[in-house]
């Protein structure tokens, strides 16, 4: 069995600094250690890597959305 | 970590409406998605509701729409979930939760959970 006290944590020092388009998103994920100094999201591209970016950013938070819509039919 | 507490169950007849609050701290409100889930005595815990980020959309299950509406107020940390037309089977407590993955209706994503409120619903 995995020794879940000693599992990696996975933290984001830095944010990228350019807008991604989301065509270019594949999921996201929430950083939710609070071993980490910054609140972040990870997002995963199309092509597997991984981005740091700000939560408090509108397009992060748009961008999540827009993934998020994908996984299901809204009721607006 | 975001701290959610919920608000505004009771006993109620059914037919009667009911609002449910929920209260979040700790974390930038505005970059979750939130969530509602209920959970009946002897029963898994179910989808009810979601709301995107900017509220632009929300989400529902099909025991509850057309009766039930989610919504939330950023400025104030809060999401709400407006419960029309009631029905015994309503009956169950409701949890809020906040997202951490990709997903709408699935609790494995969402990663911050509120106590519950009971909502009771007598014929």
């Known amino acids: 069995q995995p020794d879940a006290i000693n599992a990696p944590v996975t933290c984001c020092y830095n944010f990228t600094n350019r807008k991604i388009s989301v065509q270019r998103l594949a999921s996201y994920r929430r950083i939710t250690s609070s071993k980490c100094p910054k609140e972040a999201v990870i997002f995963k591209t199309i092509v597997a890597k991984e981005i740091c970016a700000d939560p408090k950013q509108k397009w992060v938070q748009d961008s999540m959305d827009h993934l998020d819509k994908q996984t299901q039919t809204p009721k607006t | 970590e975001v701290q959610l507490v919920e608000s505004g169950g009771g006993l109620v007849q059914a037919g009667d409406s009911l609002r449910l609050s929920c209260a979040a701290s700790g974390r930038t409100f505005s970059s979750y998605r939130m969530g509602w889930f209920r959970q009946a005595p002897g029963k898994e815990r179910e989808f009810v509701a979601a709301i995107s980020r900017s509220g632009a959309s929300a989400y529902y299950a099909d025991s509850v729409k057309g009766r039930f509406t989610c919504s939330r107020d950023n400025a104030k940390d809060t999401v709400y979930l407006q419960m029309n037309k009631l029905k015994p089977e309503d009956t169950a407590v409701y949890y809020c939760?906040?997202?951490?993955?990709?997903?709408?209706?699935?609790?494995?994503?969402?990663?911050?959970w509120g106590q519950g409120t009971q909502v009771t619903v007598s014929s």
């Open positions: 939760a906040a997202s951490s993955r990709m997903g709408v209706d699935d609790p494995e994503t969402y990663g911050y």
